[in-house]
Amino acid sequence: GCLTQLYENAFFRGGDVASMYTPNAQYCQMRCTFHPRCLLFSFLPASSINDMEKRFGCFLKDSVTGTLPKVHRTGAVSGHSLKQCGHQISACHRDIYKGVDMRGVNFNVSKVSSVEECQKRCTSNIRCQFFSYATQTFHKAEYRNNCLLKYSPGGTPTAIKVLSNVESGFSLKPCALSEIGCHMNIFQHLAFSDVDVARVLTPDAFVCRTICTYHPNCLFFTFYTNVWKIESQRNVCLLKTSESGTPSSSTPQENTISGYSLLTCKRTLPEPCHSKIYPGVDFGGEELNVTFVKGVNVCQETCTKMIRCQFFTYSLLPEDCKEEKCKCFLRLSMDGSPTRIAYGTQGSSGYSLRLCNTGDNSVCTTKTSTRIVGGTNSSWGEWPWQVSLQVKLTAQRHLCGGSLIGHQWVLTAAHCFDGLPLQDVWRIYSGILNLSDITKDTPFSQIKEIIIHQNYKVSEGNHDIALIKLQAPLNYTEFQKPICLPSKGDTSTIYTNCWVTGWGFSKEKGEIQNILQKVNIPLVTNEECQKRYQDYKITQRMVCAGYKEGGKDACKGDSGGPLVCKHNGMWRLVGITSWGEGCARREQPGVYTKVAEYMDWILEKTQSSDGKAQMQSPA
C-alpha cells in the first residue's frame, strides 16, 4: 500500500539503483516515485554531511522485500516511493530554493525582475528543466537579476551548491502550466530524425507517447509498429530530442508512427500510467511471481497491488488454467517496459496501475460566513482541492468554498446550507482559479446528497461541518484533486505553515473576488482564542487562526473553504472556515471547524453512503 512517512536521521543501507542531486527530500521522493524500480530513498541535506560530493545526494533504492535496514545518520531523511499513492503522485514541483545554485548546462541567460519570472521563463522554454536566479543582492553586480535556464542529461542538477543570494527551482511544465502548448496529433507512416535519448519496447504509440512525456529529455518520438520490416526493431519506441526542440527532419516510412511529448500541454497532462489491456499479446520480462486469478482485470489489480510489479501477462492457454482461474504472470524489467512483446498469443497483457493518479474512489486520509482579507492571488493548480459552491436561482452566485476530499466528496461548512438545503439549486465548480472564467458551458458538479452534521444548529457555531456527495465522480488532474484529511484526534502535530483560501470578501464590507485568494495564517491556541471570544465557547472541536495585529483573515464567501497546513511535504485539511468577529480585526482570530475531531463522522458517512469503504490511507 501507500506509505508516506518520512524517517528523520535515518539512511537506508544498500539496494541502490540510481543516485542524483536534488534540493530536498520531497523532490528526491518524487524522483523515486517515477523511477521504475525505486521503492525507497535516502536524502542527504547539506547540513548532514561534510563530504561536498555527497551534499544534496538523493539515493534511489530497490528491495525484494520492500524494506532495507535503516542506519542512523544525523540530518539524513529517508522514505518510500509514492507508487500506489493515487492523487499524491505528481511530477509537479513548485518550490523555490533560496541560497542554492542548481548546476547544469546553462543554455540561456536573461535579465528578469524576480525569481517567479525566471521560473515562468523556464516553464515556457521547451528545453528548460531547472533554473537559477541571482537576486539583486548577489555579490557580483554584473550577475544580478540573471536568470539562467538549464538542463542536464537526467533532468536533475549535475551538482547543487550553497550560494548566497541565488534562488533555484524547476520548470512547472509537469504542473501543466506551460504556455508553449502541445501537439496532440500523431503521425502514421512518418519517422522523425535527431538524437535518440532512450529506447524502450511498447505495445502501441500511445504508451510510447506517455513514456516520452515523463522522460526528462524526450521532446518527440518515433514508434516502430509490430509489422515493421526489421523484426528486431518491432515495437521499439525511440525517445528523441534536438537542439531546436522540434524534429529537424521527418521521413515517410511505412509502419512507423511519430509524435510529440505532451509535457508542454496546458491544463491537462496524460496520467503517468498505462491502463489499456492488450488482448492476444504477451509481455516478456523478469518473473516476479505467478498466481492463479479469475480474469485479466484481476491480474492487473494483482500486479498493481504488488508494488514491484511493472507489467503482467494473463495466460489463457489450457495448460495455464484450472477451473475458472488462469495464470497471471507478474513481471518487471530494468526500465519498466517489457523486454519482449509477442502477438497472436493466448495471453492478455498490460501494465501496473501503481502510478495512476486517479487512485480509488475514496476520501484521502493520513495516519500520522466568511473571504480572504490581506491575501494575494493564487496560481493555477496551487490549491487543487478548492471548490466554489454556487447557487443558481434567477442569477448564479458564489456562496461558499469547499474542499474536494475524494472523487465524489466535498467537505464544507454546514452553515452554507442555512435556508438553502435544496440539492438542485447548487452548482459545484472544481479545477478553477478565476470565477470570471465560468460561463454557461463550464462543466459543474451537481449534488446527489447533502449530509449536515446531526448536531449542527442554525446560528450556532458548533459542529459546522457538512459533506456533499456529488452526482458523478470527478477525475483527478493537476488542477482538481483532493486534500488529505488529518488522522483522527490529531493533536500532537505542530503545524507551522498554514494557509486559508477562498473567493470571499477582501474587506468586511467588500465583494466576492474574481481570483482565488490565499493567505498564510498562524494557528492560535484554543486558550488564546477563548480569551478573544469571551462571549462564545471555543470548543476542542474548533481551531483558531489569525495574527494578533489582524490584517489577514477569511471573510464572507470563504465559509466552508479550507484551512490547510503543510507538514513533512504534505498538505492536510486542518480546518473548515466557519466564523469570526468581523474580518481580520485585531485580536479576533478566525474560527474553523477542526477536521481531525470529525474523522469518525466523515468516515461513517462516506462509507455508509454507498456501502463500501471509502477511506484510503497513504500511510
Partner: antibody
C-alpha cells in the same frame, strides 16, 4: 491499392448457417489482424469479431459467442466468418475491416459489405 | 463494455456552417478514439484517429479534440459532400464499441 471484398451473404432461415469470405489484396494480409463489423438495416455499427495476424488469437462479441467462428487463410489472403444458429437479429450488412496501424488507430480499410438476411 | 454516447443523434445544417458532434465514453479511454463518416449504401470511412489526428486524404475542415471521456468532431465549414452519418469508436478496450451515430442533414 488496398482492397477488401466480402462475399457469401444471402437469405437464410433462422437456425441456418452461412459462411462469409473476405478476399484481401494490395497489402501484406498475413501481417495484420482482421475484424468483422456489422450494421443492421437503419442502425449503427456493431463490432462482431477479431482475429490476430497469425490466427492464433480470436475474440467475439457476446451476442455471437459460441455461434460464429472467425478464421483466416494467409496463403489465400482470405478472412472467413462461419455463422451458425443464425437469428433474425443477425440480419445486417457484414463488413470486413482492418486496422493496419499496429497501434489501435481505427479501422482504416473496409470492404463494401455483404448483406445477410435471416428470415423464415 | 464501454458505452459510447453520441449527441445529437441528428442535426440539420447548411453549407458553410460550423458543425460540432460530441461523443462521451462511459469511462476514460485516453485518446483511443476514432471518428468515421458513412454515406448511404457505402462502407464507413476513417476520418480522425487518436482523438485528433487527421487520416491521410481527409480534408482539413475536419478536426477532432478531447481525451479521457469527452470528445468532439468539428467540421469547420460544411460542404455538400459532408452530409452523411458520423460515428465515434473507442479502441481502448475489447470489445471495440461505436457511438449510435449522428446524421447530418441538409437544412
Amino acid at each position: 491499392e488496398v482492397q477488401l471484398l466480402e462475399s457469401g451473404g444471402g437469405l437464410v432461415q433462422p437456425g441456418g448457417s452461412l459462411r462469409l469470405s473476405c478476399a484481401a489484396s494490395g497489402f501484406t494480409f498475413s501481417n495484420y489482424p482482421m475484424d468483422w463489423v456489422r450494421q443492421a438495416p437503419g442502425k449503427g455499427l456493431e463490432w462482431v469479431s477479431s482475429i490476430s495476424s497469425s490466427g492464433g488469437w480470436t475474440n467475439y462479441a457476446d451476442s455471437v459467442k459460441g455461434r460464429f467462428t472467425i478464421s483466416r487463410d494467409n496463403s489465400k489472403n482470405t478472412l472467413y466468418l462461419q455463422m451458425n444458429s443464425l437469428r433474425a437479429e443477425d440480419t445486417a450488412v457484414y463488413y470486413c475491416a482492418t486496422d493496419t496501424s499496429g497501434s489501435y488507430l481505427g479501422f482504416d480499410y473496409w470492404g463494401q459489405g455483404t448483406l445477410v438476411t435471416v428470415s423464415s | 463494455d464501454i458505452q459510447m454516447t453520441q449527441s445529437p443523434s441528428s442535426l440539420s445544417a447548411s453549407v458553410g456552417d460550423r458543425v460540432t458532434i460530441t461523443c462521451r465514453a462511459s469511462q476514460s479511454i485516453s485518446s483511443y478514439l476514432n471518428w468515421y463518416q458513412q454515406k448511404p449504401g457505402k462502407a464507413p470511412k476513417l476520418l480522425i484517429y487518436a482523438a485528433s489526428s487527421l487520416q491521410s486524404g481527409v480534408p482539413s475542415r475536419f478536426s477532432g479534440s478531447g481525451s479521457g471521456t469527452d470528445f468532439t468532431l468539428t467540421i469547420s465549414s460544411l460542404q455538400p459532400e459532408d452530409f452523411a452519418t458520423y460515428y465515434c469508436q473507442q479502441s481502448y478496450s475489447t470489445p471495440p464499441t461505436f457511438g449510435g451515430g449522428t446524421k447530418v442533414e441538409i437544412k
